[in-house]
Amino acid sequence: VPGEAEQPAPELVEVEVGSTALLKCGLSQSQGNLSHVDWFSVHKEKRTLIFRVRQGQGQSEPGEYEQRLSLQDRGATLALTQVTPQDERIFLCQGKRPRSQEYRIQLRVYKAPEEPNIQVNPLGIPVNSKEPEEVATCVGRNGYPIPQVIWYKNGRPLKEEKNRVHIQSSQTVESSGLYTLQSILKAQLVKEDKDAQFYCELNYRLPSGNHMKESREVTVPVFYPTEKVWLEVEPVGMLKEGDRVEIRCLADGNPPPHFSISKGNPSTREAEEETTNDNGVLVLEPARKEHSGRYECQAWNLDTMISLLSEPQELLVNYVSDVRVSPAAPERQEGSSLTLTCEAESSQDLEFQWLREETDQVLERGPVLQLHDLKREAGGGYRCVASVPSIPGLNRTQLVKLAIFGPPWMAFKERKVWVKENMVLNLSCEASGHPRPTISWNVNGTASEGDQDPQRVLSTLNVLVTPELLETGVECTASNDLGKNTSILFLELVNLTTLTPDSNTTTGLSTSTASPHTRANSTSTERKLPEPESRG
């Protein structure tokens, strides 16, 4: 073509794959009549006529562009639809009159690659490798032109480094003309890289400018031998009997070595291997004082047959022994004195408390409880609590029952019971004393007796309500070696007026009368006589 050397640089038109390229013929009126133009594509320096414009009308030439070309802008612009990477070439328009002139357009095609896909080497990398080993592979599919890849470790770009870092990239052309880039990062890693985050970045260009896409971050398994083995105990802090205790063997190697946990036997001076669970954890549940001792962990690196031992760890399971109280079963006369002594052993300093069983009232802080001028009411339960103040929940208790010699003592002297004639009545009578009393009734019926505790007895009587019984009432008599005592139960027929509640009346029907310590079954009415009640 004459004068080609002086030709100006072609106009650059940038477009994304799949979109429409607008090729505007830049010939001025003086250079040619735009109503008479030929369009060519240039590929490998060969021109091919692809479109003619005559009297402003366009006509495609047969070939690869036949279906994708059309005229726009009153014939000054050729529109190329569905642009592909193969369309990246020079297009030129040539005016026919008055003089044959041409205008060149360089079409540049772009396509953003897909999100980069990163795959870590699943086999991992040993730290002692002599040359860089494959860390991860990054694949960027369907980009145009070929994107650039940059590898990052912990947010810093990686550069090629002899015998340390090697980046091996290759690309394939898809049938679409798009490129798929594959980049392999090879590196020599160190132990500190076990938590390193690697990712790849694809840099590419679009008509709008430069862009980049990042892969997800990955960590590569790094293998290094164990150098240190140690034991960890959970929970941390003071341990006590009954706790769930886990003794865990840990190592700084990857993969973890084979572990065993041993406990020193003081008598044989040998370490006896303990049975661990599948995770190599020794679980003591519940922990006992016998679990106290010196534990150590042994780890084997099966690759080298080297065995490593942890520093021993002393485990102390704190305990409180069974509490002993003396005397164990005290008996005393009224008016006498009693000294109760509490003893226990522990791995820590103990604190003692004496409490009244019935009320939980603290009577004494210390191992000795002294009781003087004992009354009948002093009989009953006394509890010694031995506890370790520095370890919440570590305590043991022992209950002792004090018996005061005396004749039977009735729970009530007199009581009124509301009844209906011909009903079967369930009556109860309670007495205490030492020695333990027995109870008898002055009427025939089915009686049963049960021990409440060593000094207390409860007798129940099932009896049919008869007119005679309504007249005489019912007596229960408690007796022991030291005397006897009686309680009277008055029976009253229920009528409508008696069911009107007042301050001293308990309403409701009952088939039983209970002692003051138990509630009545609700089928009859019970009215207490005015207090005070004789307890003689």
Partner: antibody, heavy 120, light 112 residues
Framework: EVQLVESGGGLVQPGGSLRLSCAAS????????MSWVRQAPGKRLEWVAT????????YYPDSVKGRFTISRDNAKNSLYLQMNSLRAEDTAVYYC?????????????WGQGTMVTVSS | DIVMTQSPDSLAVSLGERATINCKSS????????????LAWYQQKPGQPPKLLIY???TRESGVPDRFSGSGSGTDFTLTISSLQAEDVAVYYC????????FGQGTKVEIK
Amino acid sequence: EVQLVESGGGLVQPGGSLRLSCAASGFTFSSYIMSWVRQAPGKRLEWVATISSGGSSTYYPDSVKGRFTISRDNAKNSLYLQMNSLRAEDTAVYYCTRDDDYDVKVFAYWGQGTMVTVSS
Amino acid sequence: DIVMTQSPDSLAVSLGERATINCKSSRSLLNSRIRKNYLAWYQQKPGQPPKLLIYWASTRESGVPDRFSGSGSGTDFTLTISSLQAEDVAVYYCKQSYNLLTFGQGTKVEIK
């Protein structure tokens, strides 16, 4: 017949470096754990380094950790000991050893040794 | 670290007599699960490299004469040469592999 031949010993100044080699023959080198053991003049034997059959695991006592590196080239049936920052107390005969197939760490085969002298 | 102490440092025994070498460990070398001790004995003749004699405290290496025997458990071990021969003149070392690897200081056996 199992043969282990050490080389590379000699005189070196304190702070200097030396690389020992061990040429193995008569067995499948890549299947065995290998070690270096040394013996200072008139002193007890001292284990120096151990490497797994594939070369991925290495172990050292504290006395040489960080200064000595054991490595192997299974393709060449060779074991190496790179010794840096050498001290007078590293003076010893260095033996190349091979483990056996027992479930315990034993040095079943030994080379004749190579003498390393660290002196100014 | 586990310290290995041998006694005596040297021993002179008549040909045909029994030689006994003791080795004491600063801690037990017994693996209670497999009931084996991580202890080996080596023999080093003058001008030669050491040679493995015994492993697992009492298992004789193949090719080792049966006059050599190992015994003991836990922390105390013994190498016995039941009938000393002229070729047994050497330094004998015990070695533990319970925690890394350490040798005893050696016991020199001579003929009286």
